[in-house]
């Protein structure tokens, strides 16, 4: 077959090629941010000649545009400045309002490198409806100017732009309009993954953290999805698998729609996942109707075995087909439970389609919608029963139209958007589900996001100050309990001037806490072991604090899980029955455990937690410290097994200031306290400038760095003594 | 807050001793980590030498280790450096320094004495 020119260059940007330049490869242009590519695309006809999708005329020089932003068309009760045809990426417009007319939303919006308004669609209110006026967002004009109970508006957008959202609304009893906000945008225009992570996350989060089956949820996030108790979702991920889709695409589908998976499973709701592929015809990897459809080992396993060979025969978008293979396994289950059962009506469906083009054949998806909706009785009173978020990747043949029409429609949320690349995708999957804004005391959750801060990543830790200075630091447990070590106690019993700093996200300095009592392990005793030359003694360097006040919940205070207990059962995702043995068997599984802890400046430092036979080399070194052990002769009367062991190669060491924290681990995306911070044979802070700098101890160093760790599966007594009205424990 | 007072600072000559001691006022001198700064001419200040709450560890920068020695006496709240072997590099302005943590952040202490001379002659 012949091959296609390959004269295709765009002056400014760059190409990619789905399938070099054989037939069937997608040529897809882009170009650096501000710019878009005209044409976005072209195709290689079996022919050797390259075609651009949806043109007419015969091929035209491929350019870099620059990107603007739609104009207002009209602004009801007031007026914008600068009144201009469309604006530049960085150009601003200014909203005022009239006399007796209050603004609400942006007063300033910004046109940003993707072609969209930054802010919100300013509206001019002066409250007089049932419902608040809608507004006209930049570049629509809307008919209907009665915002009272049944009262109906139409959006249409100006010229060639492309409406997304509810091209209608009708202001509801409840005094809220129905469908979501109409944007009119560019059909080059496309979202940024820090928009859509937050926007796709409303709409998931709370759906699942809200099934903490520990405690009741008290507040909810917006309008997310509830589980109840006895609830159940089905997620389903469609892949697109098409000719336009690139092997290597395919492969971040796959990645992201794993990210996903494993996300989902680390929270605590009952959950099953279809995996269906689709091209010309769709195949069912995973159904919910299989049992193993629970089981994420299961489900990524699946997602794993997708190939992107498996539709090598037919290479077209059939969207409908693979929408439709939904419909029959919500048939099938339906008729399975039985229609009138409440185990059928109380499944929440949530789909999630990835694609990169609109659909080519098998007719319009959006009939298979209509099916689905109609399966699931979707009506206003069950309208949280079904989610569809429609996404769009690689903005060039996507369709924005197709793509509103499938997305759900909901007050306040987003469920279609056009990404620019599996990249940002990706992006997407690994920060939409981040329960860290939840209220309640869900255990173990740090924001993973590149963006988060130093106490967002670590909500749980806290620092211990004496008086005006930073001594310790600790672990909140719960919202009122902090643990931390005994040593930091060295005064005696009046903690009448002592402080906790708890993470807030009203201020980078945090909020103090007052403490109510401190419980001091009573076998601690830092001379106990002198008369033994050992000049210092850690065993049990344990303590609990109780926070004058219980604290408010949020991105920048949490509790850490601790093994041991239901809260930390239910985030690892194991059975009922578990205990204590099965929770150490599962955290501290191998020779060489790594783990982390937080760092004076908030930073998280890595280490390894040597277990085994490694623990016993690790703490061998303690023999050479002669100072501290003037006449040791065995290192356990030291070194017992109430300590983990870790500062081996390339571990960091934590400082002296830096006792107490909590020492964890990373699982499901939860995190665990397994140790906190004790002693150690070196202190990489000693005499530094600040808490920014740390030494690394030279290679020659005698003894070399060694960090031991109280570990807590060996305080489960002392712990459940004093926390047993706390905490719920699992049997040891 | 412990109150700090350098003494035994003077002129020595090269390869010569001394004894510097600190006196701390405040019943929680016990609680603290105490350590030594020393800070020349023209130059940051540096750490010297620290010793633990509990009097039984000890630290040292590369350039004194195995000439000085920290130690303390709870009973009479006095913190001491012997200094043997000096050197005119030793030549500096000591400072005694009182920390609750052990980290001896520059950016952090509040309590540092006045500080005692130092000058080994070559």
């Known amino acids: 077959a012949p091959s296609c020119p390959q004269n295709v260059n765009i002056s400014g940007g760059t190409f990619t090629l789905s399938h070099g330049w054989a037939p069937g490869s997608l040529l897809t242009y882009s170009c650096p941010q501000g710019l878009y590519p005209s044409p976005a695309s072209r195709l290689c006809k079996s022919s050797g000649q390259w075609q651009t999708p949806g043109a007419t005329r015969s091929l035209s020089k491929a350019v870099c545009k620059p990107v603007r932003c739609p104009a207002p068309v009209s602004f009801e009760n007031g007026i914008y400045t600068p009144r201009l045809g469309s604006y530049p990426v960085g150009g601003n417009v200014s909203f005022e309002c009239e006399d007796g007319f209050i603004l609400r939303g942006s007063p300033v919006r910004q046109c940003r490198p993707n072609g969209m308004w930054d802010g919100e669609t300013a509206v001019c209110d002066n409250g007089a409806g049932h419902c608040p006026n809608p507004g006209i967002s930049l570049g629509a004009v809307r008919t209907g100017f009665r915002f009272g109970h049944g009262d109906k508006v139409r959006y249409r957008c100006s010229s060639n732009l492309v409406l997304t959202g509810s091209s209608e609304r009708e202001c509801q009893g409840n005094g809220v309009w129905s469908g979501t906000e109409p944007i009119c945008r560019q059909p080059y225009s496309y979202d940024f993954p820090e928009d859509v992570a937050p926007a796709l996350g409303t709409s998931f989060s709370h759906m699942l953290g809200a099934t903490n089956p520990t405690q009741k949820t008290k507040e909810s996030l917006g309008r997310k999805i509830q589980i109840q108790r006895s609830g159940h979702l089905n997620l389903y991920l469609l892949l697109d698998c098409s000719q336009s889709v690139s092997e290597n695409d395919f492969l971040i589908f796959k990645e992201s729609a794993s990210l996903m998976v494993d996300r989902i499973f680390s929270f605590e709701i009952n959950v099953s996942v279809a995996i269906i592929t689709f091209a010309s015809e769709p195949k069912v990897l995973m159904s919910v109707l299989n049992d193993n459809s629970r089981d994420m080992t299961e489900v990524i396993s699946s997602l794993e075995n997708a190939n992107y060979k498996d539709h090598e025969n037919g290479t077209g978008t059939n969207t409908y087909a693979a929408l439709n293979s939904v419909y029959l396994m919500m048939n099938n289950q339906m008729r399975l439970l039985g229609m009138e059962t409440m185990a059928w009506q109380e499944i929440r469906h949530a789909i999630i389609l990835l694609t990169d083009g609109k659909s080519n054949m098998g007719g319009s998806p959006k009939t298979a919608v209509d099916h689905i909706r109609e399966i699931l009785n979707i009506n206003q009173k069950r309208n949280d029963y079904l989610d569809i978020y429609a996404i769009g990747v690689g903005k060039l043949d996507v369709d924005w139209r197709e793509l509103n029409e499938l997305g759900s429609k909901k007050d306040g949320e987003r469920h279609a958007f056009i990404l620019q690349d599996t990249k940002a995708l990706h992006q997407v999957f690994e920060h939409m589900l981040d329960v860290s804004k939840l209220t309640d005391t869900i255990c173990g959750v740090g924001n993973m996001s590149a963006n988060a801060s130093d106490q967002e990543r670590t909500p749980w830790h806290v620092t211990i100050k004496p008086k005006s200075q930073e001594t310790c630091r600790g672990a909140l447990i719960s919202d009122q309990w902090v643990l931390t070590a005994a040593h930091c106690f060295r005064d005696g019993n009046d903690h009448s001037l002592w402080r906790v700093n708890v993470g807030d996200p009203k201020s980078q300095w945090g909020k103090e806490f007052l403490i109510e009592k401190a419980v001091i392990s009573p076998g601690f005793d830092v001379f106990a072991k002198k008369n033994q030359g050992i000049l210092e003694f850690y065993g049990d360097d344990i303590a609990l604090l109780k926070l004058a006040q219980k604290v408010k919940m949020s991105t920048h205070a949490r509790p850490i899980c601790l093994p041991c207990t239901m809260e930390a059962n239910l985030a690892l995702r194991r059975p009922q029955g578990s205990t204590c043995r099965d929770h150490e068997n599962e955290l501290l599984n191998k020779q060489s455990v790594p783990a982390h802890f937080v760092a004076l400046n908030g930073s998280k430092l890595n280490i390894n937690l040597k277990m085994g036979v490694e623990w016993t080399s690790c703490a061998e070194v303690v023999s050479q410290e002669k100072t501290m052990f003037p006449n040791l002769t065995d290192v356990r009367e030291v070194v017992t097994d109430q300590f983990l062991c870790s500062g081996t190669q390339e571990d960091e060491s934590p400082c002296k200031g830096e006792s107490g924290g909590a020492v964890f681990l990373e699982r499901r995306f939860r995190f665990f306290q397994v140790g906190l911070v004790s002693w150690g044979l070196y202190n990489p802070c000693l005499g530094s400038a600040d808490k920014n700098s740390r030494k690394r101890a030279p290679r020659s160093k005698v003894p070399p760095p060694r960090d031991f760790h109280i570990n807590l599966f060996r305080m489960q007594p002392w712990l459940r003594q004093h926390l047993g009205d706390v905490l719920n424990f699992l049997p040891l | 807050q412990v109150q700090l007072v350098e003494s035994g600072g003077g002129l020595v000559q090269a390869g010569g001793s001394l004894r510097l001691s600190c006196s701390a006022s405040?019943?929680?001198?016990?609680?603290?980590?105490m350590g030594w700064f020393r800070q020349a001419p023209g130059k940051e200040r540096e750490f010297v030498a620290s010793i633990s709450w509990t009097g039984g560890s000890t630290e040292y920068a590369d350039s004194v280790k195995g000439r000085f020695t920290i130690s303390r006496d709870n009973s009479k709240n006095t913190l001491y450096l012997q200094m043997n072997s000096l050197r005119a590099e030793d030549t500096a302005v000591y400072y005694c320094a009182a920390d609750y943590s052990g980290d001896f952040l520059l950016s952090d202490l509040d309590s540092w004495g006045q500080g005692t001379l130092v000058t080994v002659s070559s």
């Open positions: 405040g019943h929680t001198f016990r609680s603290y980590y």
